[in-house]
Amino acid sequence: MAVTACQGLGFVVSLIGIAGIIAATCMDQWSTQDLYNNPVTAVFNYQGLWRSCVRESSGFTECRGYFTLLGLPAMLQAVRALMIVGIVLGAIGLLVSIFALKCIRIGSMEDSAKANMTLTSGIMFIVSGLCAIAGVSVFANMLVTNFWMSTANMYTGMGGMVQTVQTRYTFGAALFVGWVAGGLTLIGGVMMCIACRGLAPEETNYKAVSYHASGHSVAYKPGGFKASTGFGSNTKNKKIYDGGARTEDEVQSYPSKHDYV
């Protein structure tokens, strides 16, 4: 019962998390104009992964897509990639976990198979959550870097009479949505992995005992229902997850400008 609850809760938490990752990826408010130096502006700028927008006080909002692929900062491309990988892995994980749910019966699927599927989906959720957290964190780091760079620029060369206020950007709502969603997906994945242990029938580690029947002897070896680590194979001690997944995007240089309109 506890296993079913853990598995079900893990599924629901992951579902909410992946929905959040999708929402964050689609949102336009990844970075929003910092109003600290100009709180009385009648024009408000905000940017997402796919387009930048301007909202006027009049209510008129204009959004322009980033119609170039090569002209965008490498870090933005990396963030896009991480979020998409997170969504794809999460979606596959959800699909696998639906069939792995203990409360759903599909043909004569054994518990061992369900355990494997639960573990697989759990790992997928963990990686999906990590991708989202990494993507959002990379973007946040890029914002912080550019924020201080533009702050330094603001206070240099202001000796003239004309004042030019450089637009600075700070954390947008999508970052917080992404962090929370990534965290939820991660938690859901861990719960699925925990549930997997309960789903797999315990292997009793008794020594083989010989029973002597009249006439001839037959040896019975208990513990034949060991949970398999693959969907079809029953290979023992097979390592299916390294846990040391590393993206190529970790060694990217920061763009000199964040304003990629």
Partner: antibody, heavy 117, light 113 residues
Amino acid sequence: QVQLKESGPGLVAPSQSLSITCTVSGFSLTDYGVSWIRQPPGKGLEWLGVIWGGGSTYYNSALKSRLIISKDNSKSQVFLKMNSLQTDDTAIYYCAKHHYGNACDYWGQGTTLTVSS
Amino acid sequence: DIVMTQSPSSLTVTAGEKVTMSCKSSQSLFNSGNLKNYLTWYQQKPGQPPKLLICWASTRESGVPDRFTGSGSGTEFTLTISSVQAEDLAVYYCQNDYSYPFTFGSGTKLEIK
């Protein structure tokens, strides 16, 4: 079609307060902002303040302490209240509707206010 | 507050002539988010309320004759009338629509000989 019409007292004694109403038609006050602008006789335009569709207000820094702009969406009316009037507040008072670019695309004909004892 | 400075304060021209008037702001009115300048030009004919001519520094309002052209960016803007007509007799105002308060320039009075 879009129309704005200002109505005011016409004559007000110094140190008294003023209330002008702008009645609009052809658009909703929940969707568009309305600004108040005045023009003293023979002089230029002076922006007084704005009330946006969401209800947020911004005022001319020099007149902020004396001004209140409010509205009644259901009656399609915008109100300008100004206290401690002086003779230099004598002007034509206009209300104008905002559109994209934060510019004012429609203006009322204006109401003349004279501050005199 | 942003200070808007218009020059000249008045000009007298003959019909058919090209006219240029200037508007300068104390701060940049350029928004990097949409690459637009939040400067508006109004025309006020005698005894009438102002009329919107140009917004975003160069976008002509519908119904405005194409002889009116707005240009400039950042802090320096220009309104050009390519061939002045008798009906263009008016005062022309520029306005900052970028940050509060939405200040107006003092105006340029256009007179026809």
